[in-house]
């Protein structure tokens, strides 16, 4: 899916009065200084794809983060704001969702919430050169 | 059972604001769109804007910018909107509006409506 | 950004086909596939009769379709019944600002 046409203030929006008090609840009891951020984005449809990756896509040793809040809000968020997200992106992460019995937060996991919170810093800062 | 329920009719005069609710039941009301949509007297129907109660920021048709406020309320599973410095075009039923899950632009549960007259 | 275009009216007799048209831009009808109907009968709310162009929501009989060419949607009642005489809109979704565009209502007669 190629967010380009995303309404990029409205995402922003939800993410700081809600998204990201969710990421902060999910890792609470870890350090910021736990992980290191290894994946970065260079402008806002580059940062939601990322994010869009990290959130749906299971990954080796963390299969379950379709089912929390922060990854509700974030679909809702894409679904609205995203012209033709829904069509193309909605029924596969419910297939992941569906897959996914339980949640167990795991260190992997963990490590992947902390990607994503960089992420979303970066898609909150877009005119903030690369490092 | 699967149903919006609206509050009851108003008469307003013109200059002032209204406030219509709408409560949920029978579905996770956080993850499906309100919409807000009017039906003036022997007219057709309009959009006025829609939230999604999970995420709280509202999106509003460009026409009502400025004059209406659209809010949530999750631990009651009620949507509110608000209108305010109504004139009397305003006159109208306006009712709630269920967007389906993550497809919110069309609309599968609707409220009785609300009539709200404006008059001096 | 105007509303849809419908045709005021329309009629047909018990057991006929009638059609019922929805235009709109590219920037609507003709940017996406995301055209819904209403029904609408006297003093009720509105009830949902198509989505995605040609979805039939649970509980709609089959006799109610939907298509889409170009920048104009279509509603097509067949083997009209009484209870079929009611107003009927078309919606469009048309971009994250506008979001939903409604038609104006076509009356539909059952003579």
């Known amino acids: 899916y190629d967010f380009t046409n995303c309404d990029f203030e409205k995402i922003k929006a939800a993410y700081l009065s809600t998204i990201s008090k969710d990421l902060i609840t999910y890792m609470s009891g870890t350090k910021s200084t736990e992980f290191n951020n290894t994946v970065s984005c260079s402008n806002r449809p580059h940062c939601l794809t990322e994010i869009q990756s990290l959130t749906f896509n299971p990954t080796a040793g963390c299969a379950s983060l379709a089912k929390e809040m922060f990854a509700m809000k974030t679909k809702a968020a894409l679904a609205i704001w995203c012209p033709g997200y829904s069509e193309t992106q909605i029924n596969a992460t419910q297939a992941m969702k569906k897959a996914r019995k339980s949640k167990v937060t795991t260190n992997k996991c963990l490590e992947q919430v902390s990607q994503l919170q960089g992420l979303w810093r970066r898609f909150n800062r877009p005119l903030l050169k690369q490092q | 059972q699967v149903q919006l329920v609206q509050s009851g009719a108003e008469v307003k005069k013109p200059g002032s604001s209204v406030k219509v609710s709408c409560k949920a039941s029978?579905?996770?009301?956080?993850?499906?769109?309100i919409s807000w949509v009017r039906q003036a007297p022997g007219q057709g129907l309009e959009w006025l804007g829609v939230?999604?109660?999970?995420?709280?920021?509202?999106n509003y048709a460009e026409k009502f910018q400025g004059r209406v406020t659209i809010t949530a309320d999750t631990s009651t599973s009620t949507a509110y909107m608000e209108l305010s410095s109504l004139r009397s075009e305003d006159t109208a039923v306006y009712y709630c509006?269920?967007?389906?899950?993550?497809?919110?632009?069309?609309?599968?549960?609707w409220g009785q409506g609300t009539l709200v007259t404006v008059s001096s | 950004q105007s509303a849809l275009t419908q045709p005021p009216s329309a009629s047909g007799s018990p057991g006929q086909s009638v059609t019922i048209s929805c235009t709109g831009s590219?920037?609507?009808?003709?940017?996406?596939?995301?055209v819904s109907w209403y029904q609408q009968h006297p003093g009720k709310a509105p009830k949902l009769m198509i989505y995605?162009?040609?979805k039939r929501p649970s509980g709609v009989p089959d006799r109610f379709s939907g298509s889409k060419s170009g920048n104009t949607a279509s509603l097509t009642v067949s083997g009209l019944q009484a209870e079929d005489e009611a107003d009927y809109y078309c919606?469009?979704?048309?971009?994250?600002?506008?979001?939903?565009?409604f038609g104006g209502g076509t009356k539909l007669t059952v003579l």
């Open positions: 590219n920037s609507d009808i003709g940017g996406y596939n995301r």
């Open positions: 939230i999604i109660p999970l995420l709280g920021v509202p």
């Open positions: 995605e162009i040609s």
């Open positions: 509006a269920r967007g389906a899950e993550y497809f919110y632009w069309y609309f599968d549960l």
């Open positions: 919606s469009s979704y048309a971009g994250t600002d506008t979001f939903v565009l």
């Open positions: 029978g579905f996770t009301f956080g993850s499906y769109g």
